[in-house]
């Protein structure tokens, strides 16, 4: 399937001009290669009329141009002074020959329709209303007023001043006069449909002295806006239906032959195909709203329509807006699994992609919630503290410049299962959707911390060890101290030459962390984890409480003393100086404001690595929002 996209049908009138926009995938080669517009002949040959190389055919001389917009990945063909001879089949495309990537465009140029100059013309969009003005002479003021619609043979009554109304206009048509003006009457018709289009006659009086006026009512279907989006990226449908439907339920549907299947509405309906990757957001009181879909799939391509009606379903005679969505399969967004699997008590490390050109953008992770219109409250971000209920078990690791940041969630429970979005404050196309599945653990965790009852005494030495299996032998092991701003990896350096070993003793693989002397600042969550380069793997967490020597209380007044930690990897002794100052002995991110919800986010379904048989709980209470439980092991 060609990744070039444009309008399938273009219609115009003799003498007018058209502009045809064609979209191409975002690659350097495409931006610089030849663009062309050619006309298809009966033989299948496509004759170039204009190209970006500067070629211009004789018949287009002085009336056409082709402009490339590399920043938008589009090129535009402008043709002026159209004649009926321009009607035909064309291609817009890329490549050195006209057999390259292309899109078929049909152009139809019609004759100029002239109208009688006494015609009153009204042009209205579907679903709107029209007020037709019908002037008459003063002598016809007492006479009957009426509006009828012309059919082949006759003129069918719509409404008259004796309150007769055609059944198909009941509740929609009103005949009235304004103030004391006795020379004009008005007919208002609401909820206009295609069937209302046509010629009408308004009349005051009877016989030869009657006042008659020809009225031409055009009811316009909305022109679909073309949207060109990459596979796995996101799309936002911005729907502006006007103040008159501000209080009605809103919907987005996708055309399916003759019907339009609702994908989402503000009454809570949602197509299961879009579970976890769609939000609908009312914008204001003027009937504006938006629908965001992430994780675009090729089957999402098609014709979309938004509208408003109390039923939340498409209804004739109500305002609509339409789009034609094209999903480009030559996507710049990396293809990753869309499901991460973890086990209870274990951990997952999710690699979130972002546009590598925007390494300084703020990164976020939010949890999609389907209730109501759908929303995505931020759980963690580069400048957003971790939500309180995720204390000690969620962190975001930014790796500037490589196009990926990692979100780690440990101490998993089945309640963590659901959909999560990776997003940044930069290029919205790179938002990705991950489904997290959490199964009950059936085996021992890969990482285990001892002792599990972790209470350190102020001023003394305290060591915790993290046991890992042989399969992690070649990976980098680390300890980090968690705070609601991230997990600060404790610096370490080798002090002795490490013995190379071919065999691996399952019982002796451990990485230890020593706090010496224990300071009250050392209280908090610590993670033991493995990683390979910038690729994070499993983690496990432990809460270390700090008590004074004489009392059992774990509450300590803060001081500025820096903690000292030693991290020992197998036989090596690693000294690491921790100088993390925290305001509280137990990190508390404070209430996480709901305003931080990212409501209009989501772009592409994707996912990342997770450990299949992920690491373990450490015996701590996992009700992380209840900090006092941490000390009763």
């Amino acid at each position: 399937k060609s990744p070039i996209f444009g309008p399938q049908e273009v219609s115009s009138i003799e003498g007018d001009s058209v502009s045809i926009t064609c979209y191409y995938p975002d690659t350097s080669v495409n931006r610089h290669t030849r663009k062309y517009w050619c006309r298809q002949g009966a033989s299948g040959m496509c004759t170039t009329l204009i190209s970006s190389n500067g070629y211009l055919s004789k018949e287009y001389s002085g009336r056409a141009n082709l402009i490339n917009f590399p920043e938008n990945n589009t090129f535009v063909i402008n043709i002026e002074q159209l004649t009926q001879d321009d009607t035909g089949s064309y291609k817009c495309g890329l490549g050195t020959s006209n057999r390259g990537l292309s899109f078929d465009v049909s152009l139809e140029v019609s004759q100029v329709p002239e109208l009688p100059s006494d015609t009153h013309v009204y042009t209205k969009d579907i679903g709107r209303n029209v007020t037709i003005e019908c002037p008459f002479k003063r002598e016809n003021a007492p006479s009957k007023k009426s509006l009828c619609k012309k059919t082949n043979q006759s003129c069918e009554l719509v409404i008259d001043s004796t309150e007769k109304v055609n059944p198909s206009y009941i509740g929609r048509a009103k005949l009235f006069m304004k103030g004391t003006d006795l020379t004009v009457f008005y007919v208002n018709i609401s909820h206009l449909t295609h069937n209302d289009a046509g010629l009408y006659i308004c009349q005051a009086g009877e016989g030869p002295s009657a006042d008659k006026k020809n009225v031409d009512l055009q009811v316009l279907a909305p022109e679909p806006e073309l949207l060109y989006k990459d596979l796995r990226s996101s799309v936002t449908f911005e729907c502006d239906l006007g103040r008159e439907v501000a209080n009605e339920a809103k919907y987005l549907c996708r055309m399916n032959k003759e019907t339009c299947d609702v994908i989402i509405n503000t009454l809570g309906k949602r197509d299961p195909d879009f579970e976890g990757r769609i939000l609908i957001t009312p914008k204001d009181d003027n009937g504006r709203f938006s629908v965001l879909i992430t994780g675009l799939r090729k089957e999402d391509a098609g014709h979309y329509q938004c509208g408003a009606h109390s039923s939340g379903l498409p209804q004739e005679g109500w305002p609509i807006q339409t789009w034609q969505l094209f999903v480009n399969e030559e996507s710049t967004i990396p293809n990753r699994r869309s499901v991460v699997k973890g086990v209870t008590g274990g951990s997952v490390a999710i690699a979130c992609p972002y546009n590598p050109k925007e390494s300084s953008s703020l990164k976020y992770w939010c949890r999609w919630e389907g209730d109501g219109n759908g929303h995505c409250p931020v759980l963690v971000g580069t400048q957003a503290q971790v939500q309180e209920e995720y204390e000690g078990r969620l962190a975001l690791f930014d790796q500037p410049g490589n196009g990926t940041y990692t979100v780690i969630l440990n101490q998993l429970t089945t309640e963590d299962a659901g959909f999560y979005w990776c997003l940044t404050n930069g290029d919205s196309r790179w938002r990705t959707t991950i489904e997290l599945q959490v199964a009950e653990a059936t085996r021992e965790p890969n990482l285990e911390v001892t002792p599990q009852n972790a209470t350190a005494v102020l001023g003394e030495t305290f060591t915790v060890s993290c046991h890992y299996p042989c399969k992690f032998y070649s990976q980098e092991k680390y300890w980090c101290k968690w705070s609601n701003k991230g997990c600060h990896i404790l610096p370490s350096h080798d002090e002795g030459a490490r013995q190379s070993s071919v065999s691996c003793d399952q019982s002796s693989q451990l990485v230890s962390m020593t706090l010496n002397p224990v300071s009250k600042e050392d209280e908090g969550w610590y993670w033991c984890g493995v990683k390979q380069g910038q690729t994070y793997g499993e983690t496990t967490a432990i809460y270390i409480a700090v008590e004074e020597r004489t009392r059992g209380s774990s509450h300590v007044n803060p001081t500025d003393a820096n903690a000292r930690a030693k991290v020992a990897l197998e036989e090596e002794v690693v000294d690491s100086s921790i100088s993390e100052k925290e305001n509280k002995a137990i990190p508390n991110p404070g209430p996480f404001a709901n305003e931080r919800e990212i409501q209009n986010v989501g772009d592409q379904a994707q996912e990342n690595r997770a450990s299949g048989d992920a690491g373990s709980a450490d015996g701590q209470s996992r009700s992380s929002s209840s900090k006092h439980h941490h000390h009763h092991h």
């Epitope: 115009s12 009138i13 007018d16 019609s110 100029v112 329709p113 002239e114 109208l115 100059s117 006494d118 015609t119 009153h120 013309v121 009204y122 042009t123 209205k124 969009d125 029209v130 037709i132 003005e133 055009q218 316009l220 022109e223």
Partner: nanobody, 123 residues
């Protein structure tokens, strides 16, 4: 709110041609009728030509029929008035206006107006 800007006026000899442009901003002209009117000193404002944007149907006043052509460019949201075989009596300020509906030829049906562009025809 629609803003209209006319251009293309100027001095031309009788029998010559001019092309006036009316560029609209603020919103698409899709559901409007766009008309050209003219007003010579001491005279009433007079209808010249109009086009229904949605389907291109047009009306041209009898005095200019066959000489003046109204056309549109969707992408530029612009309407043109091609004036050929100009006569001294065509000299006037030409105004562009848009309407949501009503009588093509009646100026009161038009809601938004441009500032006008002067056309002078010398004999």
């Amino acid at each position: 709110e629609v803003q209209l800007v006319e251009s293309g006026g100027g001095l031309v000899q009788a029998g010559g041609s001019l092309r006036l442009s009316c560029a609209a901003s603020g919103r698409t002209l899709r559901s409007y009728i766009v008309g050209w009117f003219r007003q010579a000193p001491g005279k009433e404002r007079e209808f010249v030509a109009a086009v229904t944007w949605s389907d291109g149907r047009r009306v041209t006043a009898d005095p200019v029929k066959g000489r003046f052509t109204i056309s549109r460019d969707n992408a530029k949201n612009t309407v043109y008035l091609q004036m050929d075989s100009l006569k001294p009596e065509d000299a006037a300020v030409y105004y562009c206006a848009v309407s949501h509906g009503g009588a093509y030829v009646e100026s009161r049906a038009y809601e938004y107006w441009g500032q006008g562009t002067q056309v002078t025809v010398s004999s």
